[in-house]
Interface confidence: low
Amino acid sequence: FTITVSKDLYVVEYGGNVTMECKFPVEKQLNLFALIVYWEMEDKKIIQFVNGKEDLKVQHSSYSQRAQLLKDQLFLGKAALQITDVRLQDAGVYCCLIGYGGADYKRITLKVHAPYRNISQRISVDPVTSEHELMCQAEGYPEAEVIWTSSDHRVLSGKTTITNSNREEKLFNVTSTLNINATANEIFYCTFQRSGPEENNTAELVIPERLPVPASERTHFMILGPFLLLLGVVLAVTFCLKKHGRMMDVEKCCTRDRNSKKRNDIQFEET
């Protein structure tokens, strides 16, 4: 009794599906009640098929709702383990053990990688300095550095931060920003380069003709703030003079106004 595998190395991308197969000899009609199929990954039980049915009680929680034995394939002499929504933690060495009048087992390696494929990008402009801030963000594994380049192949200096993804513990969330004085239609590239030689992933950022007026109050305040403050001071002083007509009250009133201006500044920095 010998199990065979057509492949003992499977490669799958994070979030994808994989079906790993072990073949066993079946003569004529399969007797399900004489068949034992175990699939394990290291110390984790994934499938325990005994007496014609799967025992889900023993299934490791990390494979719950994601791993199943394809029953229709059993009749073709295949113990096929399907894993959906593959995670980085699924990488490792799997063992299929089959008992059917004899017993044998085979090992299969599953490798999982996560390219930094979906690169989010954003371009914003500082209305005071007219400097552009370019941002690229993506998730993947293993850690990546981000290389910024211009259309004339100059390497530019960006700032990259790496955090753990909210989606999965082992996944990295890489964000990189580049501050640069740029003109309309200039092209910049951010390239996510993983340690090791996996394919690099690149996004192209084109400086727009004119950035739309930002919706954020902060930007409005940066433009209108000084003008409004000046107007406020003038009105307050006028009000104080009219109402009290005394220098001391003007001073008090203006002191209060200075405090409120301070609060505005703080608010502006926090916005």
């Epitope: 190395l9 499977y10 490669v11 290291e42 110390d43 990488a91 293993p142 030689p197």
Partner: antibody, heavy 118, light 113 residues
């Protein structure tokens, strides 16, 4: 950056055993397959097998089954290969090589020369 | 086991010339799941460790000069070194990492004319 530092040259007697080490740094040791490769003087490269340090799982080239034993110590990020019942045929340079994700053998140690001689 | 053959066993070139190294496998190295050929090229200079040049038959490793170009698919593969430099003189091995045991070719020695 990634580095694989192997132990020094060994001169051993026929019939004895030798254990060579490969200390990894600059990457997550447990998540890469660590391979071992043999190269005899003037000869090509021969794949011995790999160990997956996270679980200690091994895969051997049948030719080296029983000859080589691969182990790993996660705490020190070190992989080991023990060669037993040594003969002159085992005289060679042995490399450890780390496999990055799904891509060939990317990072290599400097090699350990094992000479079997009485 | 998958057998890998390389030709020529040695080749002598002058600096600035282009050289083509061949590698053949006894069975296809194309992996249907991702349509990639699991073949790598390695450069080994005398007394040094092998250095990976090409992975997936055509992809250059980080830092490898673009004068090294890998091509081919299935069972026939080629490494082209254009405008050979003195530092390129070395042994070149191709190896498959699709099927266990992983196997390497016997190598091609690149020498100066």
């Amino acid at each position: 950056q990634v580095q694989l530092q192997q132990s020094g040259a060994e001169l051993v007697k026929p019939g004895s055993s030798v254990k060579i080490s490969c200390k990894a740094s600059g990457y997550t040791f447990t998540s890469n397959f660590m391979h071992w490769v043999k190269q005899q003087p003037g000869n090509g490269l021969e794949w011995i097998g790999w160990i997956y340090p996270e679980y200690g799982n091994t895969k051997y080239n049948q030719k080296f089954d029983g000859k080589a034993t691969l182990t790993a110590d996660k705490s020190s990020s070190t992989a080991y290969m023990q060669l037993s019942s040594l003969t002159s045929e085992d005289s060679a340079v042995y490399f450890c090589a780390s496999e990055e994700a799904v891509i060939s053998l990317v990072y290599w140690g400097q090699g350990t020369l094992v000479t079997v001689s009485s | 086991d998958i057998a890998i053959t390389q030709s020529p066993s040695s080749v002598a070139v002058s600096v600035g010339e282009t050289v083509t190294l061949s590698c053949k496998s006894s069975q296809s190295l194309l992996y249907s799941e991702n349509q990639k050929d699991y073949l790598g090229w390695y450069q080994q200079k005398p007394g040094q460790t092998p250095k990976p040049l090409i992975y997936w038959a055509t992809n250059r490793h980080t830092g490898v000069p673009d004068r090294f170009t890998g091509s081919g698919s299935g069972t026939d593969f080629t490494l082209i070194i254009s405008s050979v430099q003195a530092e390129d003189l070395a042994d070149y091995y191709c190896g498959q990492y699709l099927v266990y045991p992983f196997t390497f070719g016997p190598g091609t020695k690149l020498e100066l004319k």
